[in-house]
């Protein structure tokens, strides 16, 4: 089951999510989106990072830790109701099978 | 392709007002954030400050605190410097760069031209 | 805030030699340290990022090293069109100081 996290409308909300890199700097892919994680990736992308940097996202989603220490966490700015649901982290670690997917419920009150 | 076009030369006297404008194209406006950096004739690049273009929240360096203000026109996709009580050692280049807005994602990937602020009496 | 300290303030260099610009932090910030180009009457051109990351559309012959509060950029073999003034960026905490810049010439 996932874990809740509440915020109010217009405020930011935020989800953890962290790993530990092998190095500082030595990155591991990890994809944000909405909706529980299927299988392989990320539905619905919000948010997208690679070996080197953040390489993709959307108004309004942004990383607010240290990445590159693997605070992936992600925060919604000015959120609405229609921001309420399930978000999918996935941590893209190499190998097959090897991801670590943390679904996380987004409660806006 | 990616722009970031800046307003012309500016000329002023002490204690006028300055605005000036940076007009991005190329990428969705608000999904980076901008910054402005001053650049006094001879000297290197100080860092003013930065906005949230979706928010429209600026952040100021301490130096910059006061006489000067960011906005924003997000329907025209521009970002606008503002000094107030012009001084002649607001005489300087002035740069808009942009800027991810991840918090640790610091560097400027496209800057504009510069605009060239004159204060003289 | 970070102090960034370049060095040296000019070097004066040969076409098709190899030089090292050095840039220090007053205190460690990992590698989160970019590097710019500025050439006359032109606005800065990022060179590098987090200390190493070459950056598309950039020549090969840059390169950075370095990570804490000791940094280089090299450029392999200069060409003339290298002339500027280049700049190191402390990247890990605002206000994201610039080092004063190492102005390149060519003999």
């Known amino acids: 089951s996932e874990v809740e996290y509440r915020a109010e409308v217009g405020q930011n909300a935020y989800l953890p999510c962290f790993y530990t890199p092998a190095a500082p700097g030595n990155l591991v892919p990890v994809c944000w989106g909405k909706g529980a994680c299927p299988v392989f990736e990320c539905g619905n992308v919000v948010l997208r990072t690679d070996e080197r940097d953040v390489n993709y996202w959307t108004s309004r989603y942004w990383l607010n830790g240290d990445f590159r220490k693997g605070d992936v966490s992600l925060t919604i700015e000015n959120v609405t109701l229609a921001d309420s649901g399930i978000y999918c982290c996935r941590i893209q670690f190499p190998g097959l099978m090897n991801d670590k997917k943390f679904n996380l419920k987004l409660v806006i009150k | 392709q990616i722009q970031l076009v800046q307003s012309g030369p500016e000329l002023k006297k002490p204690g006028e007002t300055v605005k000036i404008s940076c007009k991005a194209s190329?990428?969705?406006?608000?999904?980076?954030?901008m910054s402005w950096v001053k650049q006094a004739p001879g000297k290197g690049l100080k860092l003013m400050g930065w906005i949230n273009t979706y928010s429209g929240a600026p952040t100021y360096a301490d130096d910059f605190k006061g006489r000067f203000a960011f906005s924003l026109e997000t329907s025209a996709s521009a970002a606008y410097l503002q000094i107030n009580n012009l001084k002649n050692e607001d005489t300087a280049t002035y740069f808009c760069?942009?800027?991810?807005?991840?918090?640790?994602?610091?560097?400027?990937?496209?800057w504009g031209q510069g605009t060239t602020l004159t204060v003289s009496s | 805030d970070i102090v960034m300290t370049q060095s040296p303030a000019t070097l004066s260099v040969t076409p098709g030699d190899r030089v090292s610009l050095s840039c220090r932090a007053s205190q460690s910030i990992s590698d989160y340290l970019h590097w710019y180009q500025q050439k006359s009457h032109e606005s800065p051109r990022l060179l590098i990022k987090?200390?190493?990351q070459s950056i598309s559309g950039i020549p090969s012959r840059f390169s950075g090293s370095g990570s804490g509060s000791d940094f280089t950029l090299s450029i392999n073999s200069v060409e003339p069109e290298d002339v500027g003034v280049y700049y190191c960026?402390?990247?890990?905490?605002?206000?994201?100081?610039f080092g004063g810049g190492t102005k390149l010439e060519i003999k």
């Open positions: 987090y200390a190493s």
């Open positions: 190329g990428y969705t406006f608000t999904t980076y954030g």
């Open positions: 760069a942009r800027k991810p807005p991840h918090y640790y994602v610091n560097s400027f990937d496209y």
């Open positions: 960026q402390n990247g890990h905490s605002f206000p994201y100081t």
